[in-house]
């Protein structure tokens, strides 16, 4: 199941989906749909990035973080009921089945009337921003901040794969952070 | 010795089922990726389907997909293939191939499958 | 969908001479983050499954002789065959293996004369 995210109306959306880059600058192309992760790639593609740059976006998604440190989270500005939905991160690790995809629930709330007026506090502020993996080997385990909306039951532990060797080639198709390398 | 033996092809009718079947023997298989690629006669290769080691992720191609169903049972090294809704399109040789991410490394000796009424 | 050709489609050669075999990506096959290019050889005798012969374009498959090697990059490979033997008759195939779904070459016949 999805894990998932939540914003009022009006404010902006944070989908965080992170890798490690096996050496910097050596990116992994990713690409962020609207809709669940279909087989191969995205589907309604709102972004997407290569091994350089963000080379495809749409109006309101945008990365805030470093995608060049492998921070691919996805921004989605001003949200609308409209933006609710499942979105798809894919790490696109080149290899036989070695992508990763991620499907994040989105959730948006009508925004709540306050009767005086209150600096409001940005969606993205709101919550920490890494998830993390440690350690090395086929056992390895996932290190979690406070990450609101998730059960965690919904985060399998990662394999971390001797990428390209000879070795495990098994996927964990679950968590929203890979390392390569 | 990596060994992979595929069973279960045969003659079906447009609409019918088969489940195929690939014993794997000669290296730990649950550590491995495994895939099915097809053949037609006199034609070329095509990749169908795969599935992790775990058995967590399976992927298919879009011509399969919603009637074939690969599962694979770690604790007997056996690799499926379950094939409902059989079209004509369908016949060809199916092999089983132990997976690593940049190739498929070892492939077994195939079994023909024949749609025809 | 990444699409590979081949070419020739078929090749006749002679025992002890060179023969090559190209393959060309409609796109880029190499890892950002590996450098590696992910295409793979294999020869198909008749009658036989498909073999490992290269990999990573350019890394032989243990137990394939030394007269089988691989070359090239980003989009266009080549397989060598230095001096053909006649049991290298056979169909051989390109495929990448950079992203889904996992395409193959029409395949090169290659006949001893």
């Known amino acids: 199941s999805e894990v998932e995210y939540r914003a009022e109306v009006g404010q902006n959306a944070y989908l965080p989906c992170f890798y490690t880059p096996a050496a910097p600058g050596n990116l992994v192309p990713v690409c962020w749909g609207k809709g669940a992760c279909p087989v191969f790639e995205c589907g309604n593609v709102v972004l997407r990035t290569d091994e350089r740059d963000v080379n495809y976006w749409t109006s309101r998604y945008w990365l805030n973080g470093d995608f060049r440190k492998g921070d691919v989270s996805l921004t989605i500005e001003n949200v609308t009921l409209a933006d609710s939905g499942i979105y798809c991160c894919r790490i696109q690790i080149p290899g036989i089945m070695n992508d990763e995809k991620f499907n994040l629930k989105l959730v948006i709330k009508p925004a709540k009337v306050t009767p005086a007026p209150t600096r409001q506090r940005d969606f993205t502020a709101a919550f920490p921003r890494m998830l993390t993996t440690r350690g090395h080997g086929p056992a390895e385990t996932q290190t979690l901040g406070s990450l609101p909306d998730i059960n965690l039951t919904q985060i399998s532990t990662l394999a971390n794969e001797l990428r390209d060797s000879r070795l495990a080639n098994d996927l964990r198709d679950s968590g929203a952070t890979i390392r390569i390398g | 010795e990596v060994q992979l033996v595929e069973s279960g092809g045969g003659l079906v009718q447009p609409g019918g089922s088969l489940r195929l079947s690939c014993a794997a023997s000669g290296f730990t298989f649950d550590d491995y990726t495994m895939s099915w690629v097809r053949q037609v006669p006199g034609k070329g290769l095509e990749w169908i389907s795969g599935?992790?080691?775990?058995?967590?992720?399976?992927d298919y191609v879009e011509p399969i997909e919603g009637r074939f169903t690969i599962s694979r049972d770690n604790a007997k090294n056996t690799l499926y293939l379950q094939m409902n809704s059989l079209k004509s399109e369908d016949t060809a040789v199916y092999y089983c191939?132990?997976?690593?991410?940049?190739?498929?490394?070892?492939w077994g000796q195939g079994t023909q499958v024949t749609v025809s009424s | 969908d990444i699409v590979m050709t081949q070419s020739p489609s078929s090749v006749t050669a002679s025992v002890g001479e060179k023969v090559t075999i190209n393959c060309k990506s409609s796109q880029s096959v190499v890892s950002g983050s590996n450098q590696k290019s992910y295409l793979n050889w294999y020869q198909q005798r008749p009658g036989q499954p498909p073999r490992l012969l290269i990999y990573?374009?350019?890394t032989q498959e243990s137990g394939i002789p030394d007269r089988f090697s691989g070359s090239g990059s980003t989009t266009d490979f080549t397989l060598t065959i230095s001096s053909v033997q006649p049991e290298d008759a056979a169909v051989y195939y390109c495929q990448q293996a950079y992203s889904a779904p996992y395409n193959f070459g029409s395949g090169t016949r290659l006949e001893i004369k």
């Open positions: 191939a132990k997976t690593s991410p940049q190739s498929l490394d070892y």
């Open positions: 990573y374009a350019s």
């Open positions: 599935i992790s080691g775990n058995g967590g992720r399976t």
